[in-house]
């Protein structure tokens, strides 16, 4: 931002009213008036070039310094060419001297040269030659000097003529301020420029109304240079929640809009399934029946729990059930749907029911399922099971109602035994099997059926209470089809797979484990 100039003295603007002190009185510098465009132009001039030893002084009135530390002095003046005068006037000069003196009081007409300190010799860039002067084409020069730091209450400037032909048309004394500034939503106060060129005054900014320094951000600061320019901005402010940046201010979000945190973003329109927000909203309330999960951003539409799984089937396979379902028809507007499966078993005789989580086995953990199927095994035969599949999403915990579907299945058979060949010889096969422990108590006996492969007319049956049997009197090097079935009080359980086992050939006799 451009520096602001605060004028302490302006001779040209004063219209000849300042009454500066001349020394010696009337013989050197004197005030003159000229009319240009019907306006009086005043100047202090001196032109005693033909007389040697000139020492003419012009002193300003006392200037109150105020808050200035460094002052700038702008001079506008003309200087006539010494060659305009006979013989170049040996005593003629083309420069004058600028002085200043600081003081805490106005000395009035008590002028003492010794109190003044020279600032500089002022030389023109262009001199006015005789022909230009007579044609009224004077060459106006502009020179600027600065002085600082100043410490006293006020000061005088003085101009010493040592034999030049000078007209001083403008003397402007000012100091510089960095102007009041709004930048990055921070307000920086008008600040007096420092007096030392290398130094930069650090100035703290204050956030404009409804703006804040973002968490972890730097407080706004700028640097006021000696020339009144703001430099090196650091940090910034952001419009707080519920407000957005409009030009250099923070304006409340309009009704129907919101902003949930301090950021550079504009206010956003309230998302779906929210109520119209008031002015300056930081979020938009959800419509009735819709919710926002704690981790949901405020920009996300409000959502609701899902409906129940759409379609649920329970397919029994012995002592296993495969549950399958389809996703809810209404997801509630969310994608974070998970499923929970719970199990209840009922005894047909007593009608008593209870949870069965401890006695069954799931193909994967039954809570937080993301797939739409699960297999439940280790079910007891001749038991009624009810399975509940509940659909949940991120807002289900915010309501008391649940979205679920149930399926019931009766287990009438035990699970098929798992059969192994333990050993064989040329005339025997040793077979063992297993079923889940919960079902074992319901088994009365096991029935082993076997026959030669390819002979569909005859088969043999052996019954046993144990978990193994040796089948004797078999033909060597022959394949037998073997199946094991559990027998319960209520009837037959599920049969095992039909296994093919082969006896050894006579060359390799002996009871070998397989």
């Amino acid at each position: 931002a451009q520096g602001k100039e605060v004028v302490l003295l302006d001779f040209a603007a004063a219209g000849g009213e300042l009454g500066w002190l001349t020394h010696p009185y009337g013989k050197g510098w004197d005030l003159m008036q000229n009319i240009m465009n019907d306006m009086p132009i005043y100047m202090y001039s001196v032109c005693n070039v033909m007389s040697g030893d000139q020492d003419n002084w012009l002193r300003t009135n006392w200037v109150y310094r105020g808050e200035a530390e460094r002052i700038f002095i702008e001079l506008k003046f003309t200087v006539r060419d010494c060659n305009s005068f006979p013989g170049g006037a040996s005593s003629c000069k083309e420069t004058f001297n600028l002085y200043y003196a600081e003081s805490d009081l106005d000395y009035g007409t008590n002028f003492q040269k010794r109190l003044f300190t020279k600032i500089d010799t002022i030389a023109p860039d262009e001199i006015t030659v005789s022909s230009d002067f007579e044609a009224r084409h004077v060459k106006l020069n502009v020179e600027e000097r600065s002085v600082g730091p100043l410490t006293r209450k006020g000061f005088y400037l003085a101009f010493q003529d040592i034999g030049a032909c000078v007209a001083l048309l403008s003397v402007r004394v000012y100091y510089k301020k960095c102007p009041e500034l709004l930048q990055g939503l921070a307000h920086f106060p008008e600040t007096i420029a420092g007096s030392d060129a290398p130094s930069l005054a650090t100035v703290a900014g204050t956030c404009v109304d409804h703006a804040v320094v973002p968490p972890g951000g730097e407080e706004p600061r700028m640097h006021c240079a000696v020339d009144g320019e703001w430099l090196v901005p650091i940090g910034q402010c952001l419009c707080q929640a519920g407000y957005e940046k409009v030009e250099d201010a923070c304006q409340a979000c309009s009704p129907g809009f919101f902003k949930f945190e301090a950021s550079e973003s504009p206010c956003l329109e309230c998302p779906e399934h929210t109520l119209p927000s008031p002015e300056g909203a930081t979020s938009c309330e959800c419509e009735e029946g819709f919710f926002r999960a704690p981790q949901d951003p405020a920009s996300m539409p409000c959502t609701r729990p899902p409906s129940a799984p759409h379609y649920l089937t329970a397919v029994g396979m012995g002592a296993k059930v495969e549950l399958r379902w389809t996703p809810p028809q209404d997801s509630g507007g969310r994608e974070d749907i998970v499923y929970s499966v719970t199990c209840e078993q009922c005894w047909p005789e007593s009608g008593e029911c209870g949870p069965c989580e401890a006695s069954v086995r799931y193909s994967e953990p039954p809570h937080g399922l993301t797939r739409t199927s699960v297999t439940v095994s280790d079910l007891e035969p001749h038991m009624n099971y009810t399975f509940t599949v509940e659909a949940r999403n991120g807002v289900s915990g915010l309501v008391t109602s649940r979205s679920f579907r149930t399926a019931s299945v009766s287990i009438n058979q035990t699970e098929p035994p798992k059969v192994r060949l333990e050993g064989r010889s040329t005339t025997s096969l040793s077979v063992s099997w297993s079923i889940p422990p919960p079902q074992q108590s319901r088994v009365w006996k096991y029935e082993v059926t076997y026959r030669k492969k390819g002979d569909s007319n005859s088969y043999n049956v052996r019954r046993t209470e144990g978990f193994s049997v040796t089948l004797d009197d078999l033909a060597p090097d022959t394949t037998y089809l073997v199946q094991v079935q559990a027998l319960t009080q209520e009837g037959q359980g599920a049969g095992s797979k039909v296994h093919e086992f082969q006896t050894l050939s006579p060359e390799g006799s002996g009871n070998l484990a397989v």
């Epitope: 009185y25 009337g26 004197d30 005030l31 007389s51 007409t109 009224r136």
Partner: antibody, heavy 120, light 108 residues
Framework: QVQLVQSGGGLVQPGGSLRLSCAAS????????MHWVRQAPGKGLEWVTV????????YYADSVKGRFTISRDNSKNTLYLQMNSLRAEDTAVYYC?????????????WGQGTLVTVSS | SELTQPPSVSVAPGQTVTITCQGD??????ASWYQQKPGTAPKLLIY???NRPSGVPDRFSGSSSGTSASLTITGAQAEDEADYYC????????????FGGGTKLTVL
């Protein structure tokens, strides 16, 4: 209106004294340098003396230096010329005049003039 | 330092007349011009480069060149018959301000 009204002229013997007055009105008297200019009978104008607006600075023509004293009373808006050791060659019409700017003029307002005759 | 004027000049009514003023001071400072009619105080006509106080007819104008200054009356009138004086600051330091000897203008 802006004007200067003079008084105090008359006949005086050589070596005598006379005090001329010039009453100002219609302008801020204390802001202007004031001059006395004289004109001997049938002759041209001759500058005599000047006083600064605050009265601190004065300057005289060589012909009157040491004999004449210019002074002013800004509270009374009046300019004075005290003439001592008068000579015959001081006989003239004396005009008070206002310097419109600065110390040296131009002289934009003049009094009506007062005749001083030095004769025995 | 002195300013020199011709003692007299004459002009026919309606004609243009120029009164000159010579002097070293005029190299450094502008001349002022005064008109004085018999029995009255002088009246300022021209000052500075060529400035006329209000009330002075625009037939009066001033100019300067080197050591010379001029007062020109364009279309002289009978009431312009008077004595005319030039005046300037003194650049020599001898005097503060100097007057020319005066020029009697006669309008024929």
């Amino acid at each position: 209106q802006v004007q200067l009204v003079q008084s105090g002229g008359g006949l005086v013997q050589p070596g005598g004294s006379l005090r001329l007055s010039c009453a100002a009105s219609g302008f801020t008297f204390s802001s202007y340098a004031m001059h006395w200019v004289r004109q001997a009978p049938g002759k041209g104008l001759e500058w005599v003396t000047v006083i600064s607006p605050d009265g601190h600075n004065t300057y005289y023509a060589d012909s009157v230096k040491g004999r004449f004293t210019i002074s002013r009373d800004n509270s009374k808006n009046t300019l004075y010329l005290q003439m001592n050791s008068l000579r015959a060659e001081d006989t003239a019409v004396y005009y008070c005049a206002r310097a419109s700017v600065g110390a040296t003029g131009p002289f934009d307002i003049w009094g009506q003039g007062t005749l001083v005759t030095v004769s025995s | 330092s002195e300013l020199t004027q011709p003692p007299s000049v004459s002009v026919a009514p309606g004609q243009t007349v120029t009164i000159t003023c010579q002097g070293d001071s005029l190299r450094s400072y502008y001349a002022s011009w005064y008109q004085q009619k018999p029995g009255t105080a002088p009246k300022l006509l021209i000052y500075g480069e060529n400035n006329r106080p209000s009330g002075v007819p625009d037939r009066f104008s001033g100019s300067s060149s080197g050591t010379s200054a001029s007062l020109t009356i364009t279309g002289a009138q009978a009431e312009d018959e008077a004595d005319y004086y030039c005046n300037s600051r003194d650049s020599s330091g001898t005097h503060l301000t100097v007057f020319g000897g005066g020029t009697k203008l006669t309008v024929l």
